[in-house]
Amino acid sequence: KAMHVAQPAVVLASSRGIASFVCEYASPGKATEVRVTVLRQADSQVTEVCAATYMMGNELTFLDDSICTGTSSGNQVNLTIQGLRAMDTGLYICKVELMYPPPYYLGIGNGTQIYVIDPEPCPDSDF
């Protein structure tokens, strides 16, 4: 039983450096505890952006210093990444693990290409 994970192919971050996307998984089992990890792949380098473990029906809780926030609804996780700059442009991959009860299942999405464009600085004003 494979676990399929779906996420949008492309997302454009807002001018404030915020990007949101949905990570949806087709659960082969009745998991009560799920871990979602966002991985960034750029230039063959992989870094963990954030991770959260949540109980089904409860909210996702990322660490206090995390750049991610999120909400869950059934087998769908709405992820928001903030504080993004142009240099953070890259492929953001959603990894889902069904942690409990056993058996464990792993699913990895194809990734969401997030484009971040730094806003132009405001021109000096005489006012």
Partner: antibody, heavy 119, light 106 residues
Framework: QVQLVESGGGVVQPGRSLRLSCIAS????????MHWVRQAPGKGLEWVAV????????HYADSVKGRFTISRDNSKNTLYLQMNSLRAEDTAVYYC????????????WGQGTLVTVSS | EIVLTQSPGTLSLSPGERATLSCRAS?????LAWYQQKPGQAPRLLIY???SRATGIPDRFSGSGSGTDFTLTISRLEPEDFAVYYC?????????FGQGTKVEIK
């Protein structure tokens, strides 16, 4: 660099207990699932147990369920395997292994510690 | 539990030759890894995700396949490549290994 060093192996009689330890260094220990994998003399590899991330979730192979307990101390970067009610068929080299970024394959392994169960 | 069957059990080849190792799963597998093990040493990760080379692994090693049939290919055998190779599935627990293929010098 990533390093995993096991200890605690030895010769033990059937029915007795033994505790293995694995000290990790060179990475953020709490961010990875940590596994024990064993290999009986002249045989193949067998996954034994995993302790996930914060330590609250654990999974075991059926062959050791109810007898072995995996645990971790993230403050000490250490993984443990408490082995009770040992049997002759538990004789093996026990490896501590780190789960990979992309899932529970094993990207780094310790050198292994030999456990021999014999009367 | 997913059963992985590797073939052949032993492969006798000469340095410079191409080695093709097979791993067949009892049911469809989403994620597969390959390891190399030399006598008295711990296994070493070669391939994960069926085809992604692990850090520091030479490009003569390549993995392919999906579903139930996977292949590890060593394009030109070097003297240090003679060892036992294992496949492992990691899409669902319990994580299982194949019984191994020994690549020996002919």
């Amino acid at each position: 660099q990533v390093q995993l060093v096991e200890s605690g192996g030895g010769v033990v009689q059937p029915g007795r207990s033994l505790r293995l330890s694995c000290i990790a260094s060179g990475f953020t220990f709490s961010s990875y699932g940590m596994h024990w994998v064993r290999q009986a003399p002249g045989k193949g590899l067998e996954w034994v147990a995993v302790n996930w991330y914060d330590g609250s979730n654990k999974h075991y192979a059926d062959s050791v369920k109810g007898r072995f307990t995996i645990s971790r101390d993230n403050s000490k970067n250490t993984l443990y395997l408490q082995m009770n009610s040992l049997r002759a068929e538990d004789t093996a080299v026990y490896y501590c292994a780190r789960g990979g970024v992309w899932g529970p394959y094993f990207d780094y392994w310790g050198q292994g510690t030999l456990v021999t169960v014999s009367s | 539990e997913i059963v992985l069957t590797q073939s052949p059990g032993t492969l006798s080849l000469s340095p410079g030759e191409r080695a093709t190792l097979s791993c067949r799963a009892s049911q469809s597998v989403s994620y597969l890894a390959w390891y190399q093990q030399k006598p008295g040493q711990a296994p070493r990760l070669l391939i994960y995700g069926a085809s992604s080379r692990a850090t520091g692994i030479p490009d003569r090693f390549s993995g392919s396949g999906s579903g139930t049939d996977f292949t590890l290919t060593i394009s030109r055998l070097e003297p240090e490549d003679f060892a036992v190779y294992y496949c492992q599935q990691y899409g669902s627990s319990p994580w299982t290994f194949g019984q191994g293929t020994k690549v020996e010098i002919k």
